[in-house]
Interface confidence: low
């Protein structure tokens, strides 16, 4: 159950309501838990998790990644620039999360939960952002053709793509989690 839809919250009205920051923190950790479960199935199914990071880096996926200029690192931290990067990055990840939807057998519901929870997280963060104009939304047509291309890959490349998406998304969320705690 995603945070905010927790039945325990209904049963305990005396509990202090979560602040906006706490909700975001909880939401990210919920998604990370989901990614962990998906990674488990992926690693059990293929040997991708054993591949070296260097070997995996040789791919043509344009997955969002934090860079120094994004203002999310300890050195050169910039709250506004960083928040824009987090939201933009999550919006860019959405097409890859859509791709993951048919990639799991035993964790199909978990894949859907990660996708839906990410949409909720984006909404939380957009409320927090002051400079919404700086956030660029990916082009739907470009996303549709990317999705078609990814789905047309052979089995080995699809396994590789699944693994890379999960690892990169975990990395992006983990960086975001800590950066958001400074805001």
């Amino acid at each position: 159950v995603p945070p905010g839809e927790d039945s325990k919250d209904v049963a305990a009205p005396h509990r202090q309501p979560l602040t906006s920051s706490e909700r975001i923190d909880k939401q990210i950790r919920y998604i990370l838990d989901g990614i962990s479960a998906l990674r488990k199935e992926t690693c059990n199914k293929s040997n991708m998790c054993e591949s070296s990071k260097e070997a995996l880096a040789e791919n043509n996926l344009n997955l969002p990644k934090m860079a120094e200029k994004d203002g999310c690192f300890q050195s050169g931290f910039n709250e506004e620039t960083c928040l824009v990067k987090i939201i933009t990055g999550l919006l860019e990840f959405e097409v890859y999360l859509e791709y993951l939807q048919n990639r799991f057998e035993s964790s199909e519901e978990q894949a859907r939960a990660v996708q839906m929870s990410t949409k909720v997280l984006i909404q939380f963060l957009q409320k927090k952002a002051k400079n919404l104009d700086a956030i660029t939304t990916p082009d739907p047509t470009t996303n549709a053709s990317l999705l078609t291309k990814l789905q047309a890959q052979n089995q080995w490349l699809q396994d590789m793509t699944t693994h890379l998406i999960l690892r990169s998304f975990k990395e992006f969320l983990q960086s975001s989690l800590r950066a958001l705690r400074q805001m």
Partner: antibody
Framework: EVQLVESGGGLVQPGGSLRLSCAAS????????MSWVRQAPGKGLEWVSA????????SYADSVKGRFTISRDNAKNTLYLQMNSLKPEDTAVYYC???????????????WGQGTQVTVSS | QSVVTQPSALSVTLGQTAKITCQGG??????AHWYQQKPGQAPVLVIY???SRPSGIPERFSGSSSGGRATLTISGAQAEDEGDYYC???????????FGGGTHLTVLG
């Protein structure tokens, strides 16, 4: 070359106080979170305390909360650990550790000092 | 406080592969980092963020993580790899580091 040099350790009686220092060089000290990690004789590593880059946010292990205070002087490139009400179980080698900059991800330490010995005994 | 569990000791024959595991609920949403410590020396970071290797660390060291379980793999263990290995994660707040109890690796032969 990154260097972290701890000092201020020694023998102290239970209930006494000590102030540890860690002199940092070879990196922009004011840009990085820092921690103290200790190791009791023959035991494993135990995280003690952390402080963010600016010094405005600190956190402590339950075992030292209320007795130890972490601080930093970015102008002097120095990290401190004020230890009060010391107990025999605080006996350990105390390491100063620099947090790696891989974004704001959960703490990871890419450089460690050689440690300073603190012995609490009567 | 989160708990991270790892075996207390492991033996490997020279040139063989050593796998040290680390388990804990916190590893689901936090990264695993690995440190090597030799007697009388400070710990040295050998793997960070589950599977990244700092510069200067030999390629035989690699890491992986899934489902709350992290693994440090030393492919072709050398005599100089003998020592204590610590897994480190973070507590639920993300501010406090949590260390495993350490695994003493012995390289035989």
């Amino acid at each position: 070359e990154v260097q972290l040099v701890e000092s201020g350790g020694g023998l102290v009686q239970p209930g006494g106080s000590l102030r540890l220092s860690c002199a940092a060089s070879g990196f922009t000290f004011s840009s990085y979170a820092m921690s103290w990690v200790r190791q009791a004789p023959g035991k494993g590593l135990e995280w003690v305390s952390a402080i963010n880059s600016g010094g405005g946010s600190t956190s402590y292990a339950d075992s030292v909360k209320g007795r130890f205070t972490i601080s930093r002087d970015n102008a002097k490139n120095t990290l401190y650990l004020q230890m009060n009400s010391l107990k025999p179980e605080d006996t350990a080698v105390y390491y100063c550790a620099k947090e790696g900059d891989t974004g704001w991800k959960d703490p990871m330490y890419d450089y460690w000092g050689q440690g300073t010995q603190v012995t609490v005994s009567s | 406080q989160s708990v991270v569990t790892q075996p207390s000791a492991l033996s490997v024959t020279l040139g063989q592969t050593a796998k040290i595991t680390c388990q804990g609920g916190g590893l689901r949403s936090s990264y695993a980092h690995w440190y090597q410590q030799k007697p009388g020396q400070a710990p040295v970071l050998v793997i960070y963020d589950d599977d990244s290797r700092p510069s200067g660390i030999p390629e035989r060291f690699s890491g992986s993580s899934s489902g709350g379980r992290a693994t440090l793999t030393i492919s072709g263990a050398q005599a100089e790899d003998e020592g204590d290995y610590y897994c480190q994660s973070a507590d639920s707040s993300g501010n406090a580091a949590v260390f495993g109890g350490g695994t003493h690796l012995t390289v035989l032969g």
